[in-house]
């Protein structure tokens, strides 16, 4: 994982400060509202899964 | 470090009650997801139930052979999550994990403790 | 609920070479830009390690003899070149709905 100032995180994530940690864009369909989404706004929206049955 | 320490396994007779816990450090408890999962050699891995953030009013989510009977719960406070089972069965005899997630993945898991169901 | 279909169920592999692991699921778990298909690791007497995150992403300090593959119904787990310390358990497991299922496993023995 990569600190703020240094080399950025990998393709398909984004810093977390909240969580001190490069964090998946992939989990931002269900927690959108995460900071390190912010940072994810360049990758295609996904649709909302399905995760209330 | 991660750490996860689950308790409260041991012998139950058919139709009793159990409540497991887990303590955990090493990561922010209150911005994950908790779940817990037991494994069986009948069974394999199956996904319990999930315990969801306080800014998510707690929301819960239960596999259908949980429903009804089993009860998830989490003290931020404590950084522990518990799973109260009531009217066990045979077939809830298993090795319980808990693990956190973020959103998808189960990041990390304790030793499990296990639970046998037997009279 | 979805089904996850593992095979094969168990698979002897040489020191040193591929070894491929499959996981159908019974319908989609991919979108047009992420798949929510994991992988797990569990040697024995030990509990499930993550490995491999949305399909193919490695997860922190994974070695890069792992690697994962596949979208909509079908992916691949592969490793190599396999070594001894990699003799466990590999499940798959979908983040698509709840509820969150696994496969049934399959057995990697090192020969």
């Known amino acids: 994982e990569q600190a703020p100032g240094t080399a950025p995180c990998s393709r398909g994530s984004s810093w977390s400060a909240d969580l001190d940690k490069c964090m998946d864009c992939a989990s931002c369909p269900a927690r959108p509202h995460s900071d390190f989404c912010l940072g994810c706004a360049a990758a295609p929206p996904a649709p909302f899964r399905l995760l209330w049955p | 470090e991660v750490k996860l320490g689950e308790s409260g396994g041991g012998l139950v007779q058919p139709g009793g009650s159990m409540k497991l816990s887990c303590v955990a450090s090493g990561f922010p408890f209150t911005k994950y997801w908790m779940n817990w999962v037991r494994q069986s050699p009948e069974k394999g891995l199956e996904w319990v139930a999930e315990?969801?953030?306080?800014?998510?009013?707690?929301?819960?989510h239960y596999a259908e052979s949980a429903k009804g009977r089993f009860t998830i719960s989490r003290d931020d406070s404590r950084s522990s999550v518990y799973l109260q089972m009531n009217n066990l069965r045979a077939e809830d005899t298993a090795i319980y994990y808990c693990s956190p997630t973020y959103a998808d993945t189960m990041d990390y898991w304790g030793q499990g403790t296990s639970v046998t169901v037997s009279s | 609920d979805i089904v996850l279909t593992q095979s094969p169920a168990s698979l002897a592999v040489s020191l040193g070479q591929r070894a491929t692991i499959s996981c159908k699921a019974s319908q989609s778990v991919s979108t047009s830009t992420y798949s929510y298909m994991q992988w797990y690791q569990q040697r024995p007497g030990q509990s499930p390690k993550l490995l491999i995150k949305y399909a193919s992403k490695l997860d922190s300090g994974v070695p890069a003899r792992f690697s994962g593959s596949g979208s909509g119904t079908d992916f691949t787990l592969n490793i190599h070149p396999v070594e001894e310390e990699d003799t466990a358990t590999y499940y798959c497991q979908h983040s698509w709905e709840l509820p969150y299922t696994f496969g049934g496993g399959t057995r990697l023995e090192i020969k």
């Open positions: 315990i969801r953030l306080k800014s998510d009013n707690y929301a819960t």
